[in-house]
């Protein structure tokens, strides 16, 4: 147990720590779901040349990734904290079907993708207690996400593989982008 | 997979309240997502609004500010709050849930009748 301020505490292995502030949790939620994503891409790029791939553009299509753009309010110029948290939430809503088609994509690091998956869901919850207008926020059609993922599901081997490729490149950035906008905050 | 029963429908005049619910059994009950649809009489189904696992709302703009979608997770139950109501309302009422982000809504209700009189 932490030793109360102003006793001896030279015996006591780990500091006091202040719990953490909001803003610190998100920034570490982020860099941990990111970790996991690292992994993930680690043994993609060993199973499969799609790393160094030309040809994304042809899977990218079938994809509908969300990315950030100037009008989502996150980039330096013409920042807006409100428009930009609920692009980000919105954005983590949208991938969730990706990250459910992501489950079965990989033999050693099944329970690394379940991490992310949860992960994701437990930051969009702490995101969601500093957004001021949830009432912005459209969340996915169920119906549309079941149909997408038939899609995905029925593509070839190749094309599945391309798709977890850029899944995850496309998460990698999301979250990359999200962790600076909200720093800003 | 759950299965769910919606009551709280009936006869109701023009400008009055009502609330359904829509209570879950089988399993654990902590879908993805829960959506409400109505059917009006002689037309197709048609979508109200929804409630997601982190408690975000969307409705359809014809009911938008007048039905509101809640949830109790310790009774396993979602309700519908509808106020101001129109003789358009009229129609049965149906919830479904969607188990999981790709499932699709996969449990549906049996509906509830709504009859709102001039």
């Known amino acids: 147990a932490p030793v109360p301020p102003g006793e001896d505490s030279k015996d006591v292995a780990a500091p006091h720590r202040q719990p953490l502030t909001s803003s610190e949790r998100i920034d570490k939620q982020i860099r941990y779901i990111l970790d996991g994503i690292s992994a993930l891409r680690k043994e993609t790029c060993n199973k499969s040349n799609m790393c160094e791939s030309s040809k994304e553009a042809l899977a990218e299509n079938n994809l509908n990734l969300p990315k950030m753009a100037e009008k989502d309010g996150c980039f330096q110029s013409g920042f807006n904290e409100e428009t930009c948290l609920v692009k980000i939430i919105t954005g983590l809503l949208e991938f969730e079907v990706y990250l459910e088609y992501l489950q079965n994509r990989f033999e050693s690091s099944e329970e690394q993708a379940r991490a992310v998956q949860m992960s994701t869901k437990v930051l969009i919850q702490f995101l969601q207690k500093k957004a001021k207008n949830l009432d912005a926020i459209t969340t996915p059609d169920p119906t549309t996400n079941a149909s997408l993922l038939t899609k995905l599901q029925a593509q070839n081997q190749w094309l599945q593989d391309m798709t977890t490729h850029l899944i995850l490149r496309s998460f990698k950035e999301f979250l990359q982008s999200s962790l600076r906008a909200l720093r800003q905050m | 997979q759950v299965q769910l029963v919606e009551s709280g429908g009936g006869l109701v005049q023009a400008g009055g309240s009502l609330r359904l619910s829509c209570a879950a059994s089988g399993r654990t009950f902590s879908p993805y997502t829960v959506g409400w649809f109505r059917q009006p009489p002689g037309k197709v189904r048609e979508f109200v609004g929804r409630i997601n696992w982190s408690g975000i709302r969307n409705y359809a703009d014809s009911v938008k500010g007048r039905f509101t979608i809640s949830r109790d997770n310790n009774n396993n139950t979602v309700y519908l709050q509808m106020n101001r109501l129109k003789p358009e309302d009229t129609a049965v009422y149906y919830c479904?849930?969607?188990?999981?982000?790709?499932?699709?809504?996969?449990?549906w209700g049996q509906g509830t009748q709504v009859t709102v009189s001039s």
């Open positions: 479904a849930a969607a188990s999981q982000s790709g499932s699709g809504y996969d449990s």
